[in-house]
């Protein structure tokens, strides 16, 4: 949603928690901004406090209930409002009805582990956090690899295209250092986008056998 | 309805100090901010900042700081505004005003009837 | 601080005629959320300041449809399309944008 020059971005992590970004072009003095949920068939509202992320934009978490607590609906629409302090007072300064399966980003996958490593193959399994029952198996999975001597950002893409929470690498170089990630999206929601990259999981391929390829 | 009933009149010496009233009724006292702006005689309005009965949180205009002072008693709906260190040019007509705790539309809506504050040696 | 000015300072004006004031900013008051919070106050001989206009041109309740508000920016202006009788006394305009809020020195509107 945008108001005048700001721009207000929020997503909802599928169980118990909406992470929003506020961005205002111009500085704005030293002053409290909260984010304020109300819900349209709840009976809770709730309010997180906006910190600075950068010079023009702050951030925050709408923490609704336990982590793993589904405590919203497709059906549910939540008016979520900037709100800053001026002297006593609050000012709107962005508003949006927010449909939260409409606004999807999960957890970042989480329990990376090596299930199994050879000279040239990988075998990684990982588990996803936080995630709605409702997607059942409604999710895509993108996973990425570090190579030596490269960055994140050459690594090509790997898309698996169903609810598969492992990858078998292949064509991998003997006793070489690699890096992996893994990141996962619900098929759902027209503004819905990528979770956040998994925390890189490092491993390393085994050695040749002597006197073999 | 919505009221707000302020205390009468004051003759006060320059260097000496005025507590103006302003009783709330018609509406939860604690839901709504008083402003207070002065009017000195023949002359404009001045917006002397404000206070939010909820928390007793004040805002001061730059102007008044150090002479004002607002403050409030919930249990009987009343706000009070104290200027200290009285000066002839304090002569004026002092009101209060409701307004919203979020700012959306205005900035008061209700206003008391006044008070004169004479300044005189 | 935003200093406002209004002209003219006396509006001598016909019962039936309209009226119009100005009410000029020293800065843009248009609030960083897009409103631009312009007010304007009545204030009748002997009687506490009444809102009229809020947001430039929202008139507030009970306020006769004769009153209209119009401008952005830097400028304003408050319309009393017919003046009546009862509409004599001192108009002031406020913003509520940039704290402290300031207001007009006033225009008096009085019959001729």
């Known amino acids: 949603a945008v108001n005048g020059t700001s721009r207000f971005t929020c997503f909802y992590n599928s169980r118990a928690n909406i992470s929003c970004v506020w961005s205002q072009d111009g500085a704005l003095q030293d002053t409290s901004c909260q984010v304020h949920a109300w819900p349209d068939r709840r009976r809770w509202n709730q309010t997180c406090e906006l910190l600075p992320v950068s010079q023009a934009s702050w951030a925050c978490n709408l923490i609704l209930g336990t982590p793993d607590s589904q405590k919203l609906t497709a059906v549910d629409i939540v008016t979520l409002r900037v709100m800053c302090r001026e002297g006593v007072r609050w000012r709107m300064m962005a508003i949006q009805d927010f449909k939260p399966f409409e606004n999807l980003r999960l957890m970042a996958p989480i329990s990376l582990q090596v299930v199994h490593v050879e000279t040239h193959r990988c075998n990684i399994s990982w588990k996803i956090s936080q995630a709605s029952h409702y997607f059942e198996r409604h999710l895509e999975f993108e996973a990425r690899t570090l190579s030596p001597g490269h960055t994140w950002e050459e690594a090509p893409l790997m898309t698996l295209k169903q609810k598969q929470e492992w990858i078998c690498l292949e064509t991998l170089t003997p006793d070489t250092q690699y890096e992996f990630q893994v990141r996962v999206k619900p098929l759902q929601g027209e503004f819905t986008t990528w979770s956040p990259w998994s925390q890189p999981l490092a491993f390393r391929t085994k050695p040749a056998a002597l006197g073999k390829d | 309805e919505v009221q707000l009933v302020q205390s009468g009149a004051e003759v006060k010496k320059p260097g000496a100090s005025v507590k103006v009233s302003c009783k709330a009724s018609?509406?939860?006292?604690?839901?709504?901010?008083i402003s207070w702006v002065r009017q000195a005689t023949g002359q404009g309005l001045e917006w002397m900042g404000e206070i939010y009965p909820g928390d007793g949180n004040t805002y001061y205009n730059e102007m008044f700081k150090g002479r004002v002072t607002m403050t409030r008693d919930t249990s009987i709906s009343t706000a009070y505004m104290e200027l200290s260190s009285l000066r002839s040019e304090d002569t004026a007509v002092y009101y209060c005003?409701?307004?919203?705790?979020?700012?959306?539309?205005?900035?008061?809506?209700?206003w008391g009837q006044g008070t004169t504050v004479t300044v005189s040696s | 601080d935003v200093v406002m000015t209004q002209s003219p300072l006396s509006l001598p004006v016909t019962l039936g005629q309209p009226a119009s004031i100005s009410c000029r900013s020293s800065?843009?008051?248009?609030?960083?959320?897009?409103?631009?919070?312009l007010e304007w106050y009545q204030q009748r001989p002997g009687q506490s300041p009444r809102l009229l206009i809020y947001k430039v041109s929202n008139r507030f309740s009970g306020v006769p449809d004769r009153f209209s508000g119009s401008g952005s920016g830097t400028d304003f202006t408050l319309k009393i399309s017919r003046v009546e009788a009862e509409d004599v006394g001192v108009y002031y305009c406020f913003q509520g944008s940039h704290i402290p809020w300031t207001f007009g020195g006033g225009t008096k509107v009085e019959i001729k």
């Open positions: 005003a409701r307004g919203s705790y979020t700012y959306d539309n205005y900035a008061m809506d209700f």
């Open positions: 018609g509406y939860t006292f604690t839901d709504y901010v």
């Open positions: 800065q843009n008051i248009v609030h960083s959320n897009g409103n631009t919070y």
